[in-house]
């Protein structure tokens, strides 16, 4: 069961896995959640009754019964990992800790104007896990305004001490705020010959890459495939680092693949979620349970529902045995990866999907696109919402996109004449407008946030956020779309779709069924030629066919221009304006969302 609250003055007895240092109990809970085996923890806060060397210790614990005996102890704070919970979790930690010195290897020292600048420096440095900044009130004159970048093997401090007039904090790489280059290439027939910081077993190079991405010290990796000549190294995933952050030596070797940590493009792809099945593959590990199951999918469900299960192997039933049910072996290991991988024994293996919630919800695979046709099917665009106004009568006003459990991104021009958020209703999971009746549930709008530089759609800044009164529970028919990552500015999107209930021609009416059209992006230069009387800025993006025929139109405003890249859908544009609809050589103009990511994050995380 999911227990989120912290237990004050309480210590869990026994079950210790390891001890780390964290600046708060809240962060100790996050560390526990991300640790492959931790289910419970005890954190020691600073207290006069407690030995200062034990302050800020975070003891990670495991238990077969998922609980441990409780003992009263002043200054101890205990709790449970979020592994048992179904809600979204994130390693992103923007907190700044005053008067705390987080110890690690100080590998870079420079002057910074503020703690924020120091944190940005840490976020944009490939090795940095956390930092300590000496403020201008720091007693020692020569250390004032010094920004120390630090790293450790675990990504957490080796110790934390009280120190007046300093502040500490963590890198914001896991908040998708790094400007570091995102290197997505995987190099076949390549071995990176740098120092190994760790090694694990993995079924393929993609899982190896994902493990590297969430390993604190890994910057790049080499994976030996199952055809690798040396049998003992098959399926071995070597996690690597180097002083420069890049591999120093590249050796051409057949049946090996190498690649990079995706820590600086984190929110564009699933990192924790290994959802594939591996046929004719057995994962070895500590056995948790053996259960009968009808299929490998059912086995994966059983593993996902068993909180301690990390991976599984399913052996299909022999003909007519056990009512056609096979054996489902639920397994675990110290690091979350199989201890060995064997091939040719007929098993089907895979991983728990429990960790998928550690990825941004928006990366979850959705229904495959329906090719051909213009009407959408249910669940095809689960981030699309219909925004209604109730004044003077209820009607569809604009489209919008779910980007968070309390946030809708839409166009500013939708709110011309809207006096109050009270007259707005947001409907999600809707395919046909006719589904919306008196009793259809909707989300009320608490606040409309319009970009303060917005004047009119044609001059840009046509972007607005709606804060909902209640949170959206994600399901197959209502879930968020990923924002484009700033590191992906150079991506050329080729699979883009515009959706909405808007007109199908200039003089028309709102459509009942959600419509979709695949539309190619047009360069801003090309777009500018088509709109001589307007200024097409880099904060706009255009899409359309030269011959016209497919476009957004009245009523689609505020809705998404969704582009699929690396199997993940991104909200590349917001339907904004255009000359007529689907006219020849008149592309649609959309708000270029990547240019507003900072604005969106600032507004949605202000609370």
């Amino acid at each position: 069961e999911c227990v989120t609250q912290l237990l004050k003055d309480t210590c869990f007895e026994g079950g210790d896995i390891t001890t780390v240092f964290t600046p708060s109990a809240k962060y100790c809970q996050v560390v526990c959640t991300y640790h492959p085996r931790c289910l419970l923890f005890t954190f020691t806060a600073e207290s006069p009754s407690e030995d200062p060397t034990r302050w800020f210790t975070c003891v990670l614990k495991d238990s077969v019964t998922e609980t441990l005996p409780r003992v009263n102890r002043t200054a101890a704070i205990s709790g449970y990992s979020f592994k048992q919970c179904s809600h979204q979790i994130s390693a992103c930690n923007k907190d700044i800790y005053v008067d705390l010195d987080m110890k690690g290897i100080n590998y870079n020292s420079s002057v910074a104007k503020s703690a924020q600048e120091c944190q940005e420096r840490c976020t944009d440095d490939v090795h940095c896990h956390f930092f300590t900044y000496a403020t201008r009130q720091f007693p020692s004159l020569e250390h004032r305004n010094i920004c120390l970048l630090k790293h450790t093997q675990t990504g957490t401090p080796t110790r934390i001490t009280k120190l007046d007039k300093v502040v500490s904090g963590f890198s914001l790489k896991s908040c998708a705020l790094s400007n570091l280059a995102c290197i997505r290439d995987i190099f076949p027939n390549t071995v990176f010959a740098d120092s190994n910081i760790d090694s694990v077993m993995a079924p393929d190079a993609f899982v190896c890459g994902r493990i590297c991405t969430h390993h604190p010290g890994c910057l790049f990796f080499t994976f030996f495939s199952q055809e690798w000549p040396k049998e003992s190294q098959r399926n071995l995933c070597l996690l690597k680092t180097s002083e420069s952050g890049l591999p120093s030596t590249r050796i051409k070797k057949s049946k090996a693949l190498s690649g990079f940590s995706l820590q600086s493009c984190r929110h564009s792809i699933p990192v924790f979620c290994h959802s594939s099945f591996y046929h004719d593959t057995d994962f070895l590990g500590e056995e948790l349970d053996i259960v009968a199951a009808k299929s490998h999918e059912a086995c994966q469900k059983l593993c996902t529902n068993a909180v301690r299960c990390q991976f599984f192997t399913y052996t299909p039933a022999q003909a007519s045995c056990n009512e056609g049910k096979g054996k489902c072996y639920l397994k675990l290991s110290s690091n979350g990866s199989p201890t060995k991988i064997l091939h040719g024994r007929g098993g089907i293996s895979g991983y728990t999907l429990r960790l998928c919630k550690m990825d941004n919800e928006c990366t979850t695979k959705i229904k495959p696109r329906i090719v051909g046709g213009t009407a959408s099917v249910r669940g095809e665009w689960p981030w699309q919402v219909t925004l209604h106004t109730t004044s003077p009568t209820q009607r569809h006003l604009c489209g919008g996109s779910i980007i968070g459990n309390q946030w809708i991104l839409t166009a500013a021009h939708c709110f011309y004449g809207v006096e109050s958020p009270k007259i707005l209703r947001v409907y999600s999971g809707i395919l046909n407008q006719s589904e919306i009746k008196e009793d259809t549930s909707f989300f009320g709008v608490q606040e409309i946030i319009i970009h303060d530089q917005y004047k009119m759609a044609e001059s840009g800044y046509d972007i607005a956020l709606l804060k909902l009164e209640t949170t959206v529970n994600y399901t197959d028919s209502q879930r968020p779309i990923c924002l484009p990552s700033k590191g992906d500015r150079n991506v050329i999107y080729t699979d883009c779709w515009v959706t909405g209930w808007g007109y199908r021609k200039l003089r028309d009416k709102i459509q009942n069924t959600l419509q979709k059209a695949k539309i190619p992006l047009v360069t801003n230069e090309e777009c500018q030629k088509r709109y001589r009387g307007h200024k097409i800025t880099h904060k706009m993006i255009c899409a359309g066919y030269r011959e016209g025929g497919k476009d957004a139109c009245k009523g689609d405003s505020g809705g998404p221009l969704s582009c699929k890249h690396n199997e993940v859908w991104h909200l590349v544009g917001i339907t904004s304006w255009g000359e007529g609809c689907a006219q020849r050589e008149r592309p649609g103009v959309y708000t270029n969302v990547v240019e507003y990511v900072d604005w969106i994050l600032e507004k949605t995380q202000a609370v």
Epitope: D124, V126, N179, A181, C182, D185, S244, G245
Partner: nanobody, 124 residues
Framework: QVQLQESGGGSVQAGGSLRLSCAAS????????VGWFRQAPGKKREGVAT????????YYADSVKGRFTISQDNAKNTLYLEMNSLKPEDTAMYYC?????????????????WGQGTQVTVSS
């Protein structure tokens, strides 16, 4: 000693094209971030385009996307910048630069080796 030598700059009409080259000595392009930066009079130096030479990863400033193309020839240890549809606002001194390690691709502060620059002037 690392030396970067740019060439190919010049004057061109708006809408025209130029191809800049950067030859490196004492530094291998085979596994590094190398790129083009520019500085217009009275303005800060800004990133134009960068390439991670081991793979296919390229990074462009928004203002040049779709118009400029960065490429490399590892055998010749040379970096190129193909500039099409040039605009008056592209007028600047263009520098070739190379980094040491994994960097923010368009941040000049992260690049340690610099060429002398080549002037590009675009008139309307």
């Amino acid at each position: 000693q690392v030396q970067l030598q740019e060439s190919g700059g010049g004057s061109v009409q708006a809408g025209g094209s130029l191809r800049l080259s950067c030859a490196a000595s004492g530094y291998t392009f085979s596994n590094n971030f190398v790129g083009w930066f520019r500085q217009a009079p009275g303005k800060k130096r800004e990133g134009v385009a960068t390439i991670y030479t081991l793979g296919s990863s390229t990074y462009y400033a928004d203002s040049v996307k779709g118009r400029f193309t960065i490429s490399q020839d590892n055998a010749k240890n040379t970096l190129y910048l193909e500039m099409n549809s040039l605009k008056p606002e592209d007028t600047a001194m263009y520098y070739c630069a190379a980094a040491r390690g994994w960097v923010s691709p368009l941040d000049p502060a992260r690049f340690v080796y610099w060429g002398q620059g080549t002037q590009v002037t675009v008139s309307s």
